[in-house]
Amino acid sequence: SEVEYRAEVGQNAYLPCFYTPAAPGNLVPVCWGKGACPVFECGNVVLRTDERDVNYWTSRYWLNGDFRKGDVSLTIENVTLADSGIYCCRIQIPGIMNDEKFNLKLVIKPAKVTPAPTRQRDFTAAFPRMLTTRGHGPAETQTLGSLPDINLTQISTLANELRDSRLANDLRDSGATIRIG
């Protein structure tokens, strides 16, 4: 089943997705869509990057990390209950059937009523301990035979829980990563 991430109404939700470019600036097109990943591309695209830049985005959806280094994690600003559902991150690696797709489930909870104001947390409160993706077997090393200069060396697991927004930067070392090159 999809990996589940949580946020409260009014927060910014964070959906992690990473790859490692073969070389600086050697980017791979990525799309984010609302709904499970279809056979090609992303359905209901909310954001897209190409080999150079973010070339399409919609209101409230943005990349907070450094996408030029492969951090294509999606931030959804000021979420509402309607933002609940499955999101697709697709890393469109060139070649024969090389693209990778990840389905992430976002669960939005009503905002907690607290007696005193508290610091708003920007990112989802808890992450599952293991990242699994529909359509993929166990994490393993794969070689992209059609592109001799590109290797898909690792799809790693998300092993940490995000307990506070200050840990967001650590996700690059613990998130779902596709390493190319």
Epitope: P38, V39, E41, I86, I93, G95
Partner: antibody, heavy 120, light 107 residues
Amino acid sequence: QVQLVESGGGLVKPGGSLRLSCAASGFTFSDYYMSWIRQAPGKGLEWVSSISNSGSTIYYADSVKGRFTISRDNAKNSLYLQLNSLRDDDTAVYYCARNWQGADYGMDVWGQGTTVTVSS
Amino acid sequence: DIVMTQSPSSLSASVGDRVTITCRASQNISSYLNWYQQKPGRAPKLLIYAASSLQSGVPSRFSGSGSGTDFTLTISSLQPEDFATYYCQQSYSTPLTFGGGTKVEIK
């Protein structure tokens, strides 16, 4: 008028080769994924191969992988399928089709088909 | 591979009848299910996309429903031009797969 027209079919001996073409008109060809679908005589539809709008990403059915090659020339609004090492069970009508929205919403434009007959 | 199982494989009906064709996927395909109509010697024609959305130009007597693994194509009042073979197709993952087809014949 949105249109796809296939050509290149014919009679070929087992082990032989053919190159199918699909000429597109009436739409911005480079915006769409494209696919080849085939239908053996009296049988159902079978997906063969697909290619992304830029041509950088390619997909094949296991039954044709290593024998067939899909390609496209966006400057010429053309889709191609190179058929090598043909077998009797490759005999079929071959259709090219446009994948609307990357196929998550189906193949909305089809050509009339070109017939490939593999026989000794 | 995702196996698409269509039923019935054929049916006989009269003009004006309500016809229902079912399609079952071997795994969850969300709403990535399309329906096509094919007449002898012709290319398939897209009728329904994304399980329930009517393709432009298709008569409203055609409708689709379902999500996950079970899907239905309904023709509310069969017309003479509707006698054809109908195929479902999943576009959730490669290989793209079609159902075996349902031939709708005149009773």
